[in-house]
């Protein structure tokens, strides 16, 4: 019986460990500044790091600029987006800027895209100041199904701060779907 | 066998409970306004409450102004920093302010400090308005090792809002490292 | 013994699953724009969706404009509040706005209300620009007891963005209280 109990304990430990790790996908993706699109209109950001510096991914997939869910569950999603401009970078086309982020979910089965979270601000970035900066943070709790894709859209991508501590997004699984 | 099963169940319940609690360190630290440094340049904030009001800590340590990790894991880190100024507090030296927060990680083994997250905004706080306010929120998911330290740096610390609901930072463990 | 082991495994699987699901209440509530109060002073927002679009709730209750905790625990709470104004909506009474959110906790046993988190900004929304936008995000980790209620207060409710991706708040349980 003692051996049997050890076996029960052992198998349970495996199962508990395995299910715990399997149950908790995550990703933290940081901006890849070598490939930021230009322009001031809303664009999808497709270049992110997933395996250098603070960037990491587990039990999720990064492909074609999108974070792909591999496991059904409820996830906490977040994004931090920083915009900046220094006068040495040249003159802005307009002082009135709309600095925005949109976190979107795309379902391949039903090819449609929906915005889960948005944030940002209109800003007046006057030439009287040599430096301007603004950050947006959004976060929320969402049900995600395997195969669904998360992507980030921003306005004024050419103003993005390329630092890994500045412009990033991520997700981590909190619980299963009942 | 029934007794044996009860023993298995009991030991498992203990193990499950124990491992669950041990696996989830957390902290929510609120600003200690009795000791806010002056100046407008970037400074490290070292005075935080950990055991009064909303402030609390478990399986982590607060020492020398830093939040110390006691247990390896993936943690969600967050900070909320509020700045404010009322004309009755005195006249500002400049209308052009850079109100920023930096969440940094320090490793004692390799004595180096790295910024995990940053946020903030340049603001124009004119004397034409009697009150000014601005809040920053940042959050992200990071791998932390036992012994690593988290600290908060801000610009313009004398403008910090001293309320516990305004200026705080925290962390909670989400999962083990595989 | 094999049958006994299966029984142990089975009962454990049930217990593990049940305790896991019971232990993780959550809510993500989105603004119900059909019933937003007017005015510019601080008001409590009582109309939220809990079961349409991104809105959802489990093991928590939404009643009388408040999110009610059904299970003791440590929760991560968050809110995202967007304000916007287009010149076609009419003229603002003042260009100097205080756009704020307060996440409050009310205990019925001790009838008192306390602010857990606040965020926002003073803004100058001039008539020189046709569109203005601003978003606030706050988040933090709090101990909540069964029966306690979470509510949202904002200034200038008539400027709220009514989209489900813009104005929402939520909570999810991270761990039990020791």
């Amino acid at each position: 019986i003692r051996a049997e109990k050890a076996m029960v304990d052992g198998s349970w430990l495996d199962l508990a460990k395995r299910s715990k790790l399997e149950a908790q996908p995550f990703a933290h993706l940081t901006i890849n500044a070598t490939d930021i699109p230009s322009g001031s209109h809303k664009v999808s950001l497709s270049s992110w790091y997933h395996d250098r510096g603070w960037a990491k991914i587990s039990n999720m997939t990064f492909s074609n600029g999108k974070l792909i869910v591999n496991q059904d569950g409820f996830y906490y999603l977040y994004a931090n987006i920083c915009f900046r401009h220094h006068e040495t970078s040249g003159d802005l086309a307009t002082e009135y800027l709309q600095l925005m982020v949109y976190v979107t979910k795309t379902s391949i089965k039903i090819p449609s895209s929906h915005t889960l979270m948005k944030g940002g601000s209109t800003k007046y970035w006057s030439g009287n100041s040599e430096f301007h900066f603004y950050s947006i943070n959004v976060g929320g709790f969402f049900k995600l199904r395997s195969g669904e894709e998360i992507s980030i859209e921003v306005s004024n991508p050419s103003l993005l701060d390329p630092d890994q501590d500045a412009t990033y997004f991520g997700a981590f699984k909190v619980r299963d779907i009942d | 066998i029934r007794a044996e099963k009860a023993m298995v169940d009991g030991s498992w319940l203990d193990l499950a409970k124990r491992s669950k609690l041990e696996a989830q360190p957390f902290a929510h630290l609120t600003i200690n306004a009795t000791d806010i440094p002056s100046g407008s340049h970037k400074v490290s904030l070292s005075s935080w409450y950990h055991d009064r009001g909303w402030a609390k800590i478990s399986n982590m340590t607060f020492s020398n102004g830093k939040l110390i990790v006691n247990q390896d894991g993936f943690y969600y880190l967050y900070a909320n920093i509020c700045f404010r100024h009322h004309e009755t507090s005195g006249d500002l030296a400049t209308e052009y302010l850079q109100l920023m927060v930096y969440v940094t990680k320090t490793s004692i083994k390799i004595p180096s400090s790295h910024t995990l997250m940053k946020g903030g905004s340049t603001k124009y706080w004119s004397g034409n308005s009697e009150f000014h306010f601005y809040s920053i929120n940042v959050g992200g998911f990071f791998k932390l090792r036992s012994g690593e330290e988290i600290s908060i740096e801000v610009s313009n610390p004398s403008l910090l809002d001293p309320d516990q609901d305004a200026t705080y930072f925290g962390a909670f463990k989400v999962r083990d490292i595989d | 013994i094999r049958a006994e082991k299966a029984m142990v495994d089975g009962s454990w699987l049930d217990l593990a699953k049940r305790s896991k699901l019971e232990a993780q209440p959550f809510a993500h509530l989105t603004i119900n724009a059909t019933d937003i109060p007017s005015g510019s002073h601080k008001v409590s927002l009582s109309s939220w969706y809990h079961d349409r679009g991104w809105a959802k709730i489990s093991n928590m209750t939404f009643s009388n404009g408040k999110l009610i905790v059904n299970q003791d625990g440590f929760y991560y709470l968050y809110a995202n509040i967007c304000f916007r104004h287009h010149e076609t909506s009419g003229d603002l009474a003042t260009e100097y706005l205080q756009l704020m959110v307060y996440v409050t906790k009310t205990s019925i046993k001790i009838p008192s209300s306390h602010t857990l988190m606040k965020g926002g900004s003073t803004k100058y929304w001039s008539g020189n620009s046709e569109f203005h936008f601003y978003s606030i995000n706050v988040g933090g980790f709090f101990k909540l007891r069964s029966g306690e209620e979470i509510s949202i207060e904002v200034s200038n409710p008539s400027l709220l963005d009514p989209d489900q991706d813009a104005t929402y708040f939520g909570a999810f349980k991270v761990r039990d209280i020791d």
Epitope: - | S38, H41, D91, L92, T94, Y96 | -
Partner: nanobody
Framework: EVQLVESGGGLVQSGGSLRLSCAAA??????????MGWFRQAPGKEREFVAA????????GYVDSVKDRFTISRDNTKNTMYLQMASLKPEDTAVYYC???????????????????WGQGTQVTVSS
């Protein structure tokens, strides 16, 4: 290097007015980056703070004895600061110095040691 040059001093009767100017020059000087202030030193006394103005000109601070009589202002396009002095009194007699500094605190600096650059001063004499 930043150079500050005061002008506009002179002899005036009690109750009269004067307008002091402080012109800033220097290869790297940009007025909008500097807090500016006026100090004065009466014969046999320590140099004292009179008034200061924020980089953009919307925040001003004064010593109590000159409030409602003196007005500090600036024109960043001309790299110049002014001190309009009215209802002058004999006790306002002093050498008036212009000072400038990049902000190192959130609030207007009021002590001498907080200022980096100084002018040579201009004499103001108020006769009774």
């Amino acid at each position: 290097e930043v150079q500050l040059v005061e002008s506009g001093g002179g002899l005036v009767q009690s109750g009269g007015s004067l307008r002091l100017s402080c012109a800033a020059a220097g290869y790297t000087f940009r007025a909008r980056a500097y807090v500016m202030g006026w100090f004065r030193q009466a014969p046999g006394k320590e140099r004292e703070f009179v008034a200061a103005i924020s980089t953009g000109g919307t925040w001003t601070g004064y010593v109590d004895s000159v409030k409602d009589r003196f007005t500090i202002s600036r024109d960043n396009t001309k790299n110049t600061m002014y001190l309009q002095m009215a209802s002058l009194k004999p006790e306002d007699t002093a050498v008036y110095y212009c000072a400038a500094t990049t902000p190192s605190t959130s609030y207007l600096p009021r002590s001498e040691r907080q200022y980096e650059y100084w002018g040579q001063g201009t004499q103001v004499t108020v006769s009774s």
